[in-house]
Amino acid sequence: TMAIWRSNSGSNTLENGYFLSRNKENHSQPTQSSLEDSVTPTKAVKTTGVLSSPCPPNWIIYEKSCYLFSMSLNSWDGSKRQCWQLGSNLLKIDSSNELGFIVKQVSSQPDNSFWIGLSRPQTEVPWLWEDGSTFSSNLFQIRTTATQENPSPNCVWIHVSVIYDQLCSVPSYSICEKKFSM
């Protein structure tokens, strides 16, 4: 079964701690129709003349997932738990299309970084997505921030179009992803 949430409009500002900018280059708040033009929902359901979405309010739909760009600062672990409380997980990037979509979203926040669902226990152990799946560097490279002072950056965030490792305790924003099945 799938919950159908009515799409709401927001502004390109913070609302309840969430970044509501959509997928337009000038980052102006699109109408629902312009949102459809830029990020086509795969299967939006119309009910009583109102376009409904399989995503909750304030979440952005792209292909088969809903995304929430949280603008509350948290450690990686705190961000993971915040996503869990919303019935989702930290972002897992599955394709180059999805990566492009995410880069487009976060590029409008050039001063901010966003945790994604990739971590490892220590440098000798491979990166692991939050769901336990393997990480393949074919999709993207992780640029290291390791220094002698901070030798163990074991969590991953995205900043504009670059993905970096980072100390897991550093407070940052985050991206939650909720996959839906039709």
């Epitope: 000798e124 152990v125 692991l128 769901d131 393997t134 393949s136």
Partner: antibody, heavy 118, light 107 residues
Framework: QVQLVQSGAEVKKPGASVKVSCKSS????????IHWVRQAPGQGLEWMGW????????NYAQKFQGRITMTRDTSISTAYLELSRLRSDDTAVFYC???????????WGCGTLVTVSS | DIQMTQSPSSVSASVGDRVTITCRAS??????LAWYQQKPGKCPKLLIF???SLQSGVPSRFSGSGSGTDFTLTVSSLQPEDFATYYC?????????FGPGTKVDIE
């Protein structure tokens, strides 16, 4: 649903080799590490190593180095464990398990009993 | 290798009891710890991962806590199906290692 189905029990002589299979279904085989864990009769659990089914990369526990080989056949979503130069103290149930969050083992095969006896 | 120790090695308890099992790592493992339940002749079942995250489908009477070297598995109200052996496992460094197990049996 996720399922791991293992091959049947084996009886081997000391010095021989054994190859155990683990067929996966219900998920994308190449997306998750497969671990092998053994349990001697009445004993605890012992991690032997893993294979990344996508790349074929392996990581073996040091104590098994030189006589353990993990392989996979992605066309039939099956992982294999081969243990050579068997000794009587290798008698154990061998489990395959699929990786889950935080490198835990979320799904297990039902085990393959390997008996090493002369 | 990281050594994992568990205490007690066995515990006798009754239905409805609160049972606590502890696991200690020989060095810090952050939160990279899992708990499993195993019944005789059966394969292990994941209960807790990441030290405190409940695996999907596991009853909420199971909970995990701890970080670093000291961890706890708690069963808030023991049920008949909970009599089993419980293992902790570290996933911080290779080789991954298990504790020796704690057997929970009927008092």
């Amino acid at each position: 649903q996720v399922q791991l189905v293992q091959s049947g029990a084996e009886v081997k002589k000391p010095g021989a080799s054994v190859k155990v299979s683990c067929k996966s279904s219900g998920y994308t085989f190449t997306d998750y590490y497969i671990h092998w864990v053994r349990q001697a009769p009445g004993q605890g659990l012992e991690w032997m190593g893993w294979i990344n089914p996508n790349s074929g990369d392996t990581n073996y526990a040091q104590k098994f180095q030189g006589r353990i080989t993990m392989t996979r056949d992605t066309s039939i979503s099956t992982a294999y464990l081969e243990l050579s130069r068997l000794r009587s103290d290798d008698t154990a149930v061998f489990y395959c398990a699929r990786n889950s969050g935080s490198y835990s083992f979320g799904y297990w095969g039902c085990g393959t009993l390997v008996t090493v006896s002369s | 290798d990281i050594q994992m120790t568990q205490s007690p090695s066995s515990v006798s308890a009754s239905v409805g009891d609160r049972v606590t099992i502890t696991c200690r790592a020989s060095q810090g493992i952050s939160s990279w710890l899992a708990w499993y339940q195993q019944k005789p002749g059966k394969c292990p079942k994941l209960l807790i991962f990441g030290a405190s995250s409940l695996q999907s489908g596991v009853p909420s009477r199971f909970s995990g806590s701890g970080s670093g070297t000291d961890f706890t598995l708690t069963v808030s109200s023991l049920q008949p199906e909970d009599f089993a052996t419980y293992y902790c496992q570290q996933a911080y460094s290779f080789p991954f290692t298990f504790g020796p197990g704690t057997k929970v049996d009927i008092e």
